[in-house]
């Protein structure tokens, strides 16, 4: 995009090409060669019909946000540079962007910066074989949060696994009784526990240990257990199904998950 024969401009808009994953922040820098007494700085996106759609503006030391609050303009301390950021970029934010300055009287005129291109790519999920870890290039705030949540989940799952193994192995060793029914369903939600935040991992396929003694017939063991992990503070939502031997790494929340973790 940024051809070498582009004319000199009192406005620059960089980088000329920017690629981010969806959910990440995309930040351009609009720089003025100098600051006139009075000016308005606008941030535009080029529409498919080559029209400029205004996203946000800066005027008289005041930020004027557009309709979509995800588009933010921040003046940097040197006064000539402005960060123009898309918070939690979406796939359809891909396109051509530029900034424009309107210099007010006595010498009213308009300057437009060179164009820059934003590409928002789909978030790449980690392959199932990898250990749970946050995807790369998460923002600092989210990184700590995701690591914490992941650690808690892994701990809880390990505890569940240990509890289940103990409950499954010891009664069988002592009494030889069949415990493959639903009597020992772990962490069953009580009727008075609402409201709860339910992260339902659904079907967890635990592999039976080879050394576990065969239960007496006619009790054929099922290969499936169900686990519901309960957190206080949010109503239950439909969960994902996952195998215990191939649990996905914890993913950061998508913007659709609500405003809790994403800046407005």
């Amino acid at each position: 995009l940024d051809s070498p024969d582009r004319p000199w401009s009192p406005l620059t808009f960089s980088p000329a090409q920017l690629t981010v994953q969806e959910g990440e922040n995309a930040t351009f820098t609009c720089s003025l060669a100098d600051i006139p007494d009075s000016f308005v700085l606008n941030w535009y996106r080029l529409s498919p019909r080559n029209q400029t759609d205004k996203l946000a503006a800066f005027q008289e030391d005041r930020i004027e946000p557009g309709r979509d609050r995800r588009f933010r303009v921040t003046r940097l301390p040197n006064g000539r540079d402005f960060h123009m950021s898309i918070v939690a970029a979406r796939l359809n934010d891909s396109g051509i962007y530029l900034c424009g300055a309107i210099y007010l009287p006595p010498n009213t005129q308009i300057n437009e910066s060179p164009r820059a291109e934003l590409s928002v790519t789909e978030r790449t999920l980690e392959p199932p074989t990898q250990s749970p870890s946050p995807p790369p290039r998460l923002s600092g705030q989210l990184q700590g949060l995701v690591i914490g949540v992941t650690s808690v989940l892994v701990g809880v799952l390990l505890l569940l696994l240990l509890t289940w193994v103990l409950a499954a192995v010891f009664p069988r060793a002592t009494r030889g009784a069949c415990v493959c029914g639903s009597e020992d369903e772990p962490l069953k939600e009580g009727p008075d526990a609402a409201p709860v935040f339910t992260l339902d991992y659904g079907e967890l396929d635990f592999q039976w240990r080879e050394k576990t003694p065969e239960p007496p017939a006619p009790c054929a063991p099922e290969q499936t257990e169900y686990a519901t992990i309960v957190f206080p503070g949010r109503p239950a939502s439909p969960g994902r199904r996952a195998s215990a031997s191939s649990l996905q790494g914890a993913q950061p929340p998508s913007p659709e998950d609500g405003p809790g973790l994403w800046p407005l």
């Epitope: 100098d34 000539r80 006595p106 010498n107």
Partner: antibody, heavy 120, light 113 residues
């Protein structure tokens, strides 16, 4: 009425320094971008230096870069050109020019010029 | 650097005649995104400082008589004086402001027969 008046020209020996001044009137000096342009005897016009309205950005051709410095005092409505390590090829009439179309470097107004002669 | 070449270096015409002078740039001065040509024309009369005539290749500066017409695009530009007057005796320069360093043509000297 826009007026630009250059002073400070004269005869100077090679290797020495000279400082030109340009006093502006008739317009809001601190809103506009300013330049120096010169014309050697019998030659064409040559751009020498440019400065933005508050002085934060300056521009020079390779022929004077590192030897000449453009600056401005907006309180005094004055533009300067500090010329060091002068050479005989710097002999010319120096014009102070204004770029009233903010951010585009064509020159709306020119001063009458001041003559600089570099000779031993 | 962008090199500006002006032709002819001088020409003599009679009052009332039409005159054209050429300015060529070593690279295009047309910026596709704003459709503007970054070219200006100046007039320098004997004993005077230069005066802006035309900018954006074809926009006349206020106060400039309409007999001065700028045209052209990309690398080839023309200044036309539709009916030369005695007071048009001068050297005419083109200048590109597309990029630094700013550069001028060597000038076309207009003489009146």
């Amino acid at each position: 009425e826009v007026q630009l008046v250059e002073t400070g020209g004269g005869l100077v020996q090679p290797g020495r320094s000279l400082k030109l001044s340009c006093v502006a009137s008739g317009f809001t000096f601190n809103n506009y971008w300013m330049s120096w342009t010169r014309q050697a005897p019998g030659k064409g016009l040559e751009w020498v230096a440019s400065i933005t309205n508050s002085g934060v950005s300056t521009y020079y051709p390779d022929s004077v870069k590192g030897r000449f410095t453009i600056s401005r005092d907006n309180a005094q409505n004055t533009l300067y050109l500090q010329m060091n390590s002068l050479r005989s090829e710097d002999t010319a009439t120096y014009f102070c020019t204004s770029a009233l179309n903010w951010g585009y470097w064509y020159f709306d107004f020119w001063g009458p010029g001041t003559m600089v002669t570099v000779s031993s | 650097d962008i090199v500006m070449t002006q032709t002819p270096s001088s020409q003599a015409v009679s009052a009332g005649e039409k005159v054209t002078m050429s300015c060529k740039s070593s690279q295009s001065l047309l910026y596709s995104e704003n459709k503007k040509n970054y070219l200006a024309w100046y007039q320098r009369k004997p004993g005077q400082s230069p005066k802006l005539l035309i900018y954006w290749a074809s926009t006349r500066e206020s106060g400039v008589p309409d007999r001065f017409i700028g045209s052209g695009s990309g690398t080839d530009f023309t200044l036309t004086i539709s009916s030369v007057q005695a007071e048009d005796l001068a050297v005419y320069y083109c200048q590109q402001y597309y990029n630094f360093p700013l550069t001028f043509g060597s000038g076309t000297k207009l003489e009146i027969k």
